[in-house]
């Protein structure tokens, strides 16, 4: 059936200093090597967790404990499939000053993202 990266692309606005978890759901592959990319640079592997939902359905999580200005940018996940790199649609992470109210907006069109999860 090939690769499916599920979800909708997201514009995410977060208050400075707050935690955020991004997740990426991959279907149609056994044990994918999910990589997270920020503005074109691969994010270190140790900042992520993998969860096998089933043999061909995986979720990768990227945890950011305390979002700062340097974390703002465009994130996506990618996996290798048959020698080719499949790339998800991006999520744009933007910041508002500490204490401001943050809103996250979901733009619903075909995408490779599931919704990021907030955690306090």
């Amino acid at each position: 059936a090939g690769l499916k990266l599920m979800g909708a692309p997201v514009k995410l606005t977060v208050s400075q200093g707050q935690p955020v978890k991004l997740n990426c759901s991959v279907e149609g592959m056994e044990e994918p090597d999910i990589q997270w990319v920020k503005d074109g640079a691969v994010v270190q592997n140790l900042d992520q967790l993998y969860i096998p939902v089933s043999e061909q359905h995986w979720i990768g999580f990227l945890s950011l404990k305390s979002v700062e200005r340097s974390d703002a940018g465009r994130y996506w996940c990618q996996v290798e499939d048959g020698g080719e790199t499949e790339i998800s649609q991006p999520v744009w992470l933007t910041l508002v000053p500490r204490g401001s109210s943050a809103h996250h907006h979901h733009h619903h069109h075909h995408s490779a993202w599931s919704h990021p999860q907030f955690e306090k």
Epitope: L49, I59, S63, K65, S66
Partner: antibody
């Protein structure tokens, strides 16, 4: 039930090579990272490095890079820690640790670990 | 290389609150984890992601983090809590893990 079975204690001379093992059961070996942790006698814990079973992606702590090799055999669900040339300072207990996460209904993961019982390595002339 | 600093020892009487600290420059950005190691045994994960209790850990154990310091709190310490406690976190570069030097908790 998840189990990590480590190889038995070993005594070696300085300069000798050695490979110790950690065999996993009770889960799909390739799903998770396996770390190796060193504890010298009467001392604290030191993170050596880790490997993901499926892709053999390895990462090492700066103190251990180049001195040890971490590898895995998917067919036997076994992780390995290897030395080409042991030193007396390698005398320690070595633990393997399996890292995992699960979601109970929600999508935010719960993190957990399983530790092996440890392998005591003694390097002495 | 990156370091996490813990006090070598902490002593409390049974029923008192024990606090064990861990300081590291990357802790504002990286989660702290806490382990308990009793004599002759493998370590056990007590707290993960600063403040989440691991499965099967009593409620008297809690964790917090502020700035460059993470704290493990044992409210109403019991004799069986006597052990070595280690903090653990990612380096500032995010590509390797580090343990603190360990704190020996004495409950007497």
């Amino acid at each position: 039930e998840v189990q990590l079975v480590q190889s038995g204690a070993d005594v070696k001379k300085p300069g000798a090579s050695l490979t110790i093992s950690c065999q996993a059961s009770g889960y799909t070996f390739t799903d998770y990272w396996i770390s190796w942790v060193r504890q010298k006698p009467g001392k604290g814990l030191e993170w050596m490095g880790q490997i993901r079973g499926q892709h053999s992606s390895t990462l090492y702590g700066p103190s251990f890079q180049g001195h040890v090799t971490i590898s895995a055999d998917r067919s036997t669900a076994t992780a390995y820690l290897q030395w080409r040339s042991l030193e007396a300072s390698d005398t320690a207990m070595y633990y393997c640790v399996r890292h995992g996460a699960s979601t109970s209904g929600g999508t935010i993961p719960e993190y957990y670990q399983h530790w092996g019982p440890g392998t005591l390595v003694t390097v002495s002339s | 290389s990156y370091e996490l600093t813990q006090p070598p020892s902490v002593s409390v009487s049974p029923g008192q609150t024990a606090r064990i600290t861990c300081s590291g420059d990357a802790l504002p950005k990286k989660y702290a984890y806490w382990y308990q190691q009793k004599s002759g045994q493998a370590p056990v994960l007590v707290i993960y992601e600063d403040a989440k209790r691991s499965s099967g850990i009593p409620e008297r154990f809690s964790g917090s983090s502020s700035g460059t310091m993470a704290t493990l709190t044992i409210s109403g310490a019991q004799v069986e809590d006597e052990a070595d406690y280690y903090c653990y976190s990612l380096s500032d570069s995010g590509n390797y893990f580090v343990f603190g030097g360990g704190t020996k908790l004495t409950v007497l």
